[in-house]
């Protein structure tokens, strides 16, 4: 399955929007820094089967969408930028969704797929619990925004690797 050219443009736009969402200096939030243990191994090559990689990317973006579409995020972040961000993520999801559906039944290792989906889910659980613990403070959102930028960049790198393998 070939992701459309607009997909990588959308990725870049989403990253730019995340960068623009910054409301306070990260330096004022150093005490709130947290290691969310990004599941790096799920984004390494490790004989990554394409069908599985696309499903993992889809899960990553779906969880990002859900994280940023809560009433708490609307209160903490710029609504106009959020709305634009939703549009980009929605497009990403549509692109990946059609790819996942084309590759349906192609996953060779269901157990590896389960582990990957669960690893991404747990990563976002850690982020969700962190925000809850910090009572959705502006610093907590700044830490999370920076973390999602990092994870988004890593997702983009995986997509580039998939493209170069075609």
């Amino acid at each position: 399955c070939d992701l459309p050219q607009t997909h990588s443009l959308g990725n870049r736009r989403a990253l730019i929007l995340l960068a623009q969402m910054r409301r306070i200096s990260p330096f004022s939030c150093l005490k709130d820094r947290h290691d969310f243990e990004f599941p790096q191994e799920e984004f390494d090559d490790k004989q990554f089967q394409k069908a599985q990689a696309i499903s993992v990317l889809h899960e990553m973006i779906q969880q990002t969408f859900n994280l940023f579409s809560t009433k708490d995020s609307s209160a903490a972040l710029d609504e106009t930028l959020l709305d634009e961000f939703y549009i980009e993520l929605d497009q990403q999801l549509n692109d990946l969704e059609s790819c996942v559906m084309q590759e349906v039944g192609v996953i060779e290792s269901p157990l590896m797929y389960e582990d990957s989906i669960l690893a991404v889910r747990k990563y976002f659980q850690r982020i969700t619990l962190y925000l809850t613990e910090k009572k959705y403070s502006s610093c907590a959102w700044e830490v999370v925004r920076a973390e999602i930028m990092r994870s988004f960049s890593l997702s983009i790198n995986l997509q580039k690797r998939l493209k170069s393998k075609e």
């Epitope: 969408f65 859900n66 999801l93 996942v100 797929y113 669960l118 659980q125």
Partner: antibody, heavy 119, light 108 residues
Framework: QVQLVQSGAEVKKPGASVKVSCKAS????????MHWVRQAPGQGLEWMGE????????IYAQKFQGRVTMTRDTSTSTVYMELSSLRSEDTAVYYC????????????WGQGTLVTVSS | EIVLTQSPATLSLSPGERATLSCSAG???????LYWYQQKPGQAPRLLIY???NLASGIPARFSGSGSGTDFTLTISSLEPEDFAVYYC?????????FGQGTKLEIK
């Protein structure tokens, strides 16, 4: 508000199949995995599997692999759980429950569908 | 598969008393993925506590959760008449997700 409405009770003969539906409303249907959990009379809860309504991929508990099929219809925001080769031990209330994270994990359940398997 | 064993199977107490329900896991469960549900006859389960110790929305403060590793506890500080029900612990730390067999809290 989030609502999950399930289909009505069913009576089936051993060896037959049953298909239970769960219609979702009050949220973006394709954004959350939907799970199926069953409960035999007077017994505990048992997780059967889950489906991502966005693309239809499924993860099933090993115990039900080969007998359960979860599908979805995005046009009606409905997920389905079909169980085949029914036996008397499959008599249970079947629930759909929405996934999520933190306080949203299984925070929303359908009302349950009683499936009775009897000859 | 992570087996969750709840004890006691039945707990008979009076309103106003303190209830302590246990959930023991066959192998270690990360506290972030341990949940508690309440179920009343003829109803679907209701989320009480998420991630071991966090109260779900609308749940009264008399409910609390604690624990780590393989041992988890649900405590109800002072029982109200509406608290008499079946309680389940649940883990989604690894597939397949599992539930305990339940503890029935009944009026003495």
């Amino acid at each position: 508000q989030v609502q999950l409405v399930q289909s009505g009770a069913e009576v089936k003969k051993p060896g037959a199949s049953v298909k239970v539906s769960c219609k979702a409303s009050g949220y973006t249907f394709t954004n959350y995995w939907m799970h199926w959990v069953r409960q035999a009379p007077g017994q505990g809860l048992e997780w059967m599997g889950e489906i991502n309504p966005s693309h239809g991929r499924t993860i099933y508990a090993q115990k039900f692999q080969g007998r359960v099929t979860m599908t979805r219809d995005t046009s009606t925001s409905t997920v389905y759980m079909e169980l085949s080769s029914l036996r008397s031990e499959d008599t249970a209330v079947y629930y759909c429950a929405r996934g999520g994270l933190g306080p949203a994990w299984f925070a929303y359940w359908g009302q349950g569908t009683l499936v009775t398997v009897s000859s | 598969e992570i087996v969750l064993t709840q004890s006691p199977a039945t707990l008979s107490l009076s309103p106003g008393e303190r209830a302590t329900l246990s959930c023991s896991a066959g192998s270690s469960v990360d506290s972030s993925y341990l949940y508690w549900y309440q179920q009343k006859p003829g109803q679907a389960p209701r989320l009480l506590i998420y991630s071991t110790s966090n109260l779900a929305s609308g749940i009264p403060a008399r409910f609390s959760g604690s624990g780590s590793g393989t041992d988890f506890t649900l405590t109800i500080s002072s029982l109200e008449p509406e608290d008499f029900a079946v309680y389940y612990c649940h883990q989604w730390s690894s597939y397949p997700f599992t539930f305990g067999q339940g503890t029935k809290l009944e009026i003495k």
